[in-house]
């Protein structure tokens, strides 16, 4: 069951999932000057059975100038930073550590992909937060959020994380001591 909204925003923090539950959608978004092709799903879907899950549909981007029924309106200011290679590497390292039944790993990038991935998560999904470069994590509890179903409505739990302005980045998904390499994996994730 899809979560009704997006995970909570934490100032100066980003979130990631270690693995994605079946039913998760990843929008096929393209970088500026490109758009998704007009045939094929607008998203990839984590699908499968209890023994094996994978992403169904493939995202493809094409030059936006090539379509006569597609217009590009005045471009908005770039709001997203380029996804850093190191961030992608750490993301893939995290994904490589897990092979959970009923879950998909982080899908590989596609050509001319947008700089930010837009997921539609499902109930039971956990996402982990880390402070962005230059901010230090102060924890009052787990730096994670879980999409839960309560009385027929979905809600995300509030991550117990504050990011303060210091020079060192925090470890991801979050230990008390900040470290430079963001590829720690919570012990509890393997049993989820």
């Amino acid at each position: 069951e899809l979560c009704d909204d997006d995970p909570p925003k934490i100032t100066h923090a980003t979130f990631k999932a270690v693995a994605y539950k079946e039913g998760t959608m990843l929008n096929c978004e393209c970088k500026r000057g490109f758009r998704r092709i007009k045939s094929g799903s607008p998203y990839m879907l984590c699908t499968g059975n209890s023994s094996h899950s994978s992403w169904d549909n493939q995202c493809q981007c094409t030059s936006s100038a090539a379509r006569n029924t597609t217009k590009q309106v005045t471009p908005q200011p770039e709001e997203q930073k380029e996804r850093k290679t190191t961030e992608m590497q750490s993301q893939m390292q995290l994904a490589d550590q897990v092979s959970l039944p009923g879950h998909c790993r982080e899908p590989p990038p596609w050509e001319n992909e947008a700089t930010e991935r837009i997921y539609h998560f499902v109930v039971g999904q956990t996402v982990y937060y880390q402070c962005v470069q230059g901010y230090r994590a102060l924890h009052r509890g787990p730096a994670e959020s879980v999409c839960k179903m309560t009385h027929g409505k979905t809600r995300w739990t509030q991550p117990q994380l504050i990011c303060t302005g210091e020079t060192e980045p925090s470890q991801f998904p979050g230990e008390e001591e900040p470290q430079a390499s963001p590829d720690g994996l919570p012990e509890s994730e393997t049993s989820r």
Partner: antibody
Framework: QVQLQQPGAELVRPGTSVKMSCKAA????????IGWVKQRPGHGLEWIGD????????NYNEKFTGKATLTADTSSSTAYMQLSSLTSEDSAIYYC???????WGQGTLVTVSA | DIQMTQSQKFMSTSVGDRVSVTCKAS??????VAWYQQKPGQSPKALIY???YRYSGVPDRFTGSGSGTDFTLTISNVQSEDLAEYFC?????????FGGGTKLEIK
């Protein structure tokens, strides 16, 4: 809670234009496509087009090219659809939809009448 | 454009029964099909995405199935509140298109 707010009704004269709004709340407006759907009794649901507020892209159903114009204002998280050269055929309920059709507005009833 | 055909405009059923609403695509759309429920005077409500996945808050008596060109929405243990019109939609190829709708009547 994701919400798409639309005005309830618009009464307009034939030959004129109407611009209807769809104000989004509860999610990151610039991240998701917003689509528009027309519903007329006996004609079912028709997809008009969609717009990506962040990327600035628009797709139109060719049937509605020249009839509908889609715009979006990220500062107010509002999408707009303008319909021009109105005739009785344009009398319908118009819905805005977002987040891969998961969320629908309540619809704006457009009545074209002299 | 891809046509989505719901051959039955009306279906009659009783509370507690099981009913299947069908939808046929004019060409292969994979599993890129959604189902919507529209009650009188309301906007459509999303029930199913990707042919078989339920949206949050949708009772598990609603089940979607099918791939390619033939799709089915099954309502088991029909309740009086299921009185509504049901639409299928394909989003495999622009322009997205909808079926003509099937009205479910409760005896």
């Amino acid at each position: 809670q994701v919400q798409l707010q639309q005005p309830g009704a618009e009464l307009v004269r034939p030959g004129t234009s109407v611009k209807m709004s769809c104000k989004a709340a509860g999610y990151t407006f610039s991240n998701y496509w917003i689509g528009w759907v027309k519903q007329r009794p006996g004609h079912g649901l028709e997809w008009i087009g969609d717009i990506h507020p962040g990327g600035g892209y628009i797709n139109y159903n060719e049937k509605f090219t020249g009839k509908a114009t889609l715009t979006a204002d990220t500062s107010s998280s509002t999408a707009y659809m303008q319909l021009s050269s109105l005739t009785s055929e344009d009398s319908a309920i118009y819905y805005c939809v977002s987040r891969n059709f998961a969320n629908w507005g309540q619809g704006t009833l457009v009545t074209v009448s002299a | 454009d891809i046509q989505m055909t719901q051959s039955q405009k009306f279906m009659s059923t009783s509370v507690g029964d099981r009913v299947s609403v069908t939808c046929k695509a004019s060409q292969n759309v994979g599993t890129n099909v959604a189902w919507y429920q529209q009650k009188p005077g309301q906007s459509p409500k999303a029930l199913i995405y990707s042919a078989s996945y339920r949206y949050s808050g949708v009772p598990d008596r609603f089940t979607g199935s099918g791939s390619g060109t033939d799709f089915t929405l099954t309502i088991s243990n029909v309740q009086s509140e299921d009185l509504a019109e049901y639409f299928c939609q394909q989003y495999n190829s622009y322009p997205w298109t909808f079926g003509g709708g099937t009205k479910l009547e409760i005896k």
